[in-house]
């Protein structure tokens, strides 16, 4: 049993950090590997991740990690019983993929404004809280070409635009993601969609 | 929000022992280290150890060796500083502070005074 | 246990820029992140930078933080009187085993 690929691992900077790898064959990662993982700090305890299947050769885990900051560096062994296949370590705030926003709602009760409101993945006490930015996608059910993307360089979790800027009439679905520039981070995941019917009043024509 | 109580000032003869208490609440107690520092009059900050409230392990200044005892009780989310042996210098107030690499929040300090 | 040399006191007048520094060594400063706390008379320490320059959620942004070899700065702008307090820098050394070091302390006088 060897590694093919070894493990690459993501942090959400707050309690878990995701790692993956591929072994060179067929293998049930829940029975036959353990990856330990353990803080290089004073009075740090050694922790056991067991891994779940990710197609047939892949193994994910999932590192459940407290009070997470740059200073923290992991180390990582992975065992097949007791055949050490893979030592490595894990810098989390090197490798930071923000939680995805949640909670995306438009509020269309606003004069002929939609308001697009999410909210921060983070708790006010971990630095992410105040440094994410968003990608907002919204795009037509009906029209694959009417697709956009507005970006919130701002701190507040939301979005106002014009509704006269989306056609009339039809549905749109919004969705939202997150990145922080501070920690140079991957993009976090698309929160779910939320749908509306876009409908506004046309100005009078003279 | 985060609260760490600390017990009341103590008066201690020297060559006597001062157990200080610290209640954490508003966070996981066994998620982050605890910290013990003190200041003594007109003194600086002086670190003295750190507990790992999740195993209860310690690590103590090479200063207090010998003489300091930390523990924790998870039950009730405190954590102890015991000093024996005191000694005059060792009046100070006496803090707790959450953290690892540095310290978060701190109790508002139990003052203990060492006096014949 | 390793002592960070910071002045003993600086001063300026309200609306002014004050910078505090603390010098340590390779095994502390050179080789961890610094952090910076402020007491106030009467108070508990309280944290004002981390990670050489990070604040935490409710430090306004008049305080900052940096670092350079095994030297770190504290600046303050737009000294306000509530500013007066005893300001420590700190950090940890793996010289012989972990240990948590401050600063010397520093008094700021808001004139």
């Known amino acids: 049993m060897k590694v093919l690929q070894e493990p690459t691992c993501v942090s959400d900077y707050m309690s878990i950090s995701t790692c993956e790898w591929k072994m060179n064959g067929p293998t049930n990662c829940s029975t036959e590997l353990r990856l330990l993982y353990q803080l290089v700090f004073l009075l740090s305890e050694a922790h056991t991740c067991i891994p779940e299947n990710n197609g047939g050769a892949g193994c994910v885990c999932h590192l459940l990690m407290d009070d997470v900051v740059s200073a923290d560096n992991y180390t990582l062994d992975l065992w097949a019983g007791q055949q050490l296949l893979w030592k490595g370590s894990f810098k989390p705030s090197e490798h930071v993929k923000p939680r995805a926003p949640g909670n995306l709602t438009v509020h269309t009760n606003v004069s002929d404004t939609l308001l697009l409101t999410w909210s921060n993945p983070y708790p006010p006490d971990n630095y992410l809280y105040n440094h994410l930015t968003y990608a907002v996608n919204i795009w037509s059910e009906n029209d694959p070409a009417d697709f956009r993307i507005y970006n919130v360089t701002y701190l507040e979790p939301s979005l106002r635009i014009a509704a006269s800027t989306l056609k009339s009439g039809i549905s749109y679905r919004a969705r939202v993601r997150a990145w922080a520039q501070c920690y140079n981070t991957t993009w976090s995941e698309w929160s779910p969609s939320t749908k509306w019917h876009n409908s506004y009043r046309e100005p009078f024509e003279q | 929000q985060v609260q760490l109580v600390q017990s009341g000032a103590e008066v201690k003869k020297p060559g006597a022992s001062v157990k200080v208490s610290c209640k954490a609440s508003g966070y996981a107690f066994t998620s982050y280290y605890m910290h013990w520092a003190r200041q003594a009059p007109g003194q600086g900050l002086e670190w003295v150890g750190i507990?790992?409230?999740?195993?209860?392990?310690?690590s103590y200044a090479q200063k207090f060796q010998g003489r300091v005892t930390m523990t924790r009780d998870t039950s009730t989310s405190t954590v102890y500083m015991e000093l024996s042996s005191l000694r005059s210098g060792d009046t100070a107030v006496y803090y707790c502070?959450?953290?690892?690499?540095?310290?978060?929040?701190w109790g508002k300090g139990t003052l203990v005074t060492v006096s014949s | 246990q390793a002592v960070l040399t910071q002045p003993p006191s600086v001063s300026a007048a309200p609306g002014q820029k004050v910078t505090i520094s603390c010098s340590g060594g390779s095994s502390n400063i050179g080789n961890s992140y610094v952090s910076w706390y402020q007491r106030l008379p009467g108070a508990a320490p309280k944290l004002l930078i981390y990670d050489n320059n990070k604040r935490p959620s409710g430090i306004p942004d008049r305080f900052s933080g940096s670092k350079s070899g095994t030297s770190a700065t504290l600046a303050i702008t737009g000294l306000q009187t509530g500013d007066e307090a005893d300001y420590y820098c700190g950090t940890w050394d793996t010289s012989t085993g972990w240990e948590w070091p401050f600063g010397t302390g520093t008094k700021l006088t808001v004139l």
């Open positions: 507990i790992n409230p999740s195993g209860g392990s310690t």
């Open positions: 502070a959450r953290g690892k690499y540095w310290m978060y929040d």
